[in-house]
Amino acid sequence: QAVPPYASENQTCRDQEKEYYEPQHRICCSRCPPGTYVSAKCSRIRDTVCATCAENSYNEHWNYLTICQLCRPCDPVMGLEEIAPCTSKRKTQCRCQPGMFCAAWALECTHCELLSDCPPGTEAELKDEVGKGNNHCVPCKAGHFQNTSSPSARCQPHTRCENQGLVEAAPGTAQSDTTCKNPLEPLPPEMSGTMLM
C-alpha cells in the first residue's frame, strides 16, 4: 500500500480525510491532524511536515492549512457565555446566557436576545435545545395555572383543597390557583384568591 507522497493520475487520494491531492506535483500528500498546521509543504520526495498550533490558536480538522485559526472568546455583550474552552483542536464553545435565545446565526450563534415573557395563563413550550429560539407560549393545560409574566415560569397544578382538609371556595383558572376555605367559615369577598385557615 502506497504511503504519502504517492502519484495520483486521477486526482483522488485513498484517504480523503487524512490525505489531499497536490496538483503541482500530481501527488497525494498527508494532511496535518487537528491541532497542527503545515509547516513545510510536501514534495515528490518528502511528505507534509506538521507543527503544533501555537497557544490561543486551533485547527479542528485534518487540514493542509499553513496557519492555525485564532481562538475567540464568547462575547458577553452579544449575550454569549463559554461552555467549553478553546484548545488546539477545537474552537471556544459558546451558548446564550440564561434567559436568552439565539437571534443571529452564521454557522454558529453570534448574537443572543432576551427571551420574551409568557403572560399569565401560559408557559414557554419546552425545546430540545435551550437557547435555540425565542419562547413560544402555550396555554396551561387543564388543572394548572401560571400567574406571572415571565420567560421561565412553569404552569403549576391547582391546589386540591380536600388534601388539606379544606373545601373549594373558588375554582382555579389558567391564571389563578384554586381558593380554599375552612369548611366552617364563609369566604369574605375581599379574600378571594387566598387560602383561609
Epitope: 487537528p34 491541532g35 503544533t52 498550533c53 501555537a54 497557544e55 490561543n56 479542528e60 480538522h61 461552555i83 467549553a84 474552552p85 478553546c86 484548545t87 488546539s88 483542536k89 477545537r90 474552537k91
Partner: antibody, heavy 121, light 113 residues
C-alpha cells in the same frame, strides 16, 4: 526519548506542605500543556490541575482549589505542584502527564512513573 | 462535571477470547463541528502509570496492537480486545476531554479466566 520524571513525594503531616517537581525531556516542553493526575491507593484516577504551554492558563479540581498551585519553568523544562494545607485524603500517587495540546483539556499521551505522597500523623 | 461510568468493574476472559468494556458519560462528548468524540482509553498495569491506547474514541495510538479497538459515540463507548493476550491483564480507564475538568471512569480490571 520522551520522558517525564516526578520527584518530591514523601510523608507529611496533615496541614503540612510539599512541592512536587516533574522534569521533562525529549519534546518541546513549552509547546504542550501539562497536568497532575493522582491515584489514591486502590482508587480511581483524578485530574488535579492543568497548566497551558505558556503557563498563562491554569485550572484546578474543586477538591484542591485554594490549596494547590501548579506552575512551570519552561527554561528548565520543569513542572511543579505546590501543595499546602494537606489532608489525609490527598494521599495518593501523583503523576505528571503531558497533553497533546497547548491546552490541558486533551488526551494525556505521556505519563511519568509517579511519586507517592502520604499525609498522615 | 461530566461523570464517567464504567462497566463491569472486573472481567475474567479466557486467552484468545474477546473482552468488552463499556463506558458511559453523563453528557454528550461528541463535538458536532468535526464529528469527533472527545474520549480516550488508557491501560494501566500494576505498578505502572496509565498508557494511552485510544483517543477520539476510536483512533489507536501509534504502537498499540490492532486487537484493541474503540467504538461508540455521544455518551456510550466500548473498548474491545478482540483476542485477549496474557500481557493485556490490566485495569482499563476511559476519560473524557470534552470539557473541564477532564474526568476518568473508575476502571475495569481485566483478568485471565
Amino acid at each position: 526519548e520522551v520522558q517525564l520524571v516526578e520527584s518530591g513525594g514523601g510523608l507529611v503531616q496533615p496541614g503540612g506542605s510539599l512541592r512536587l517537581s516533574c522534569a521533562a525531556s525529549g519534546f518541546t516542553f513549552s509547546s504542550y500543556a501539562m497536568s497532575w493526575v493522582r491515584q489514591a491507593p486502590g482508587k480511581c484516577l483524578e485530574w488535579v490541575s492543568g497548566i497551558s504551554g505558556s503557563g498563562g492558563r491554569t485550572n484546578y479540581a474543586d477538591s484542591v482549589k485554594g490549596r494547590f498551585t501548579i506552575s512551570r519553568d519552561n527554561s528548565k523544562n520543569t513542572l511543579y505542584l505546590q501543595m499546602n494545607s494537606l489532608r489525609a485524603e490527598d494521599t495518593a500517587v501523583y503523576y505528571c502527564a503531558k497533553s497533546d495540546n497547548w491546552h490541558y483539556l486533551d488526551a494525556f499521551d505521556i505519563w511519568g512513573q509517579g511519586t507517592m505522597v502520604t499525609v498522615s500523623s | 462535571d461530566i461523570v464517567m461510568t464504567q462497566s463491569p468493574d472486573s472481567l475474567a476472559v479466557s486467552l484468545g477470547e474477546r473482552a468488552t468494556i463499556n463506558c458511559k458519560s453523563s453528557q454528550n462528548v461528541l463535538y458536532s463541528s468535526n464529528n469527533k468524540n472527545y474520549l480516550t482509553w488508557y491501560q494501566q498495569k500494576p505498578g505502572q502509570p496509565p498508557k494511552l491506547l485510544i483517543y477520539w474514541a476510536s483512533t489507536r495510538e501509534s504502537g498499540v496492537p490492532d486487537r484493541f479497538s474503540g467504538s461508540g459515540s455521544g455518551t456510550d463507548f466500548t473498548l474491545t480486545i478482540s483476542s485477549l493476550q496474557a500481557e493485556d491483564v490490566a485495569v482499563y480507564y476511559c476519560q473524557q476531554y470534552f470539557n473541564t475538568p477532564p474526568t476518568f471512569g473508575c476502571g475495569t480490571k481485566v483478568e485471565i479466566k
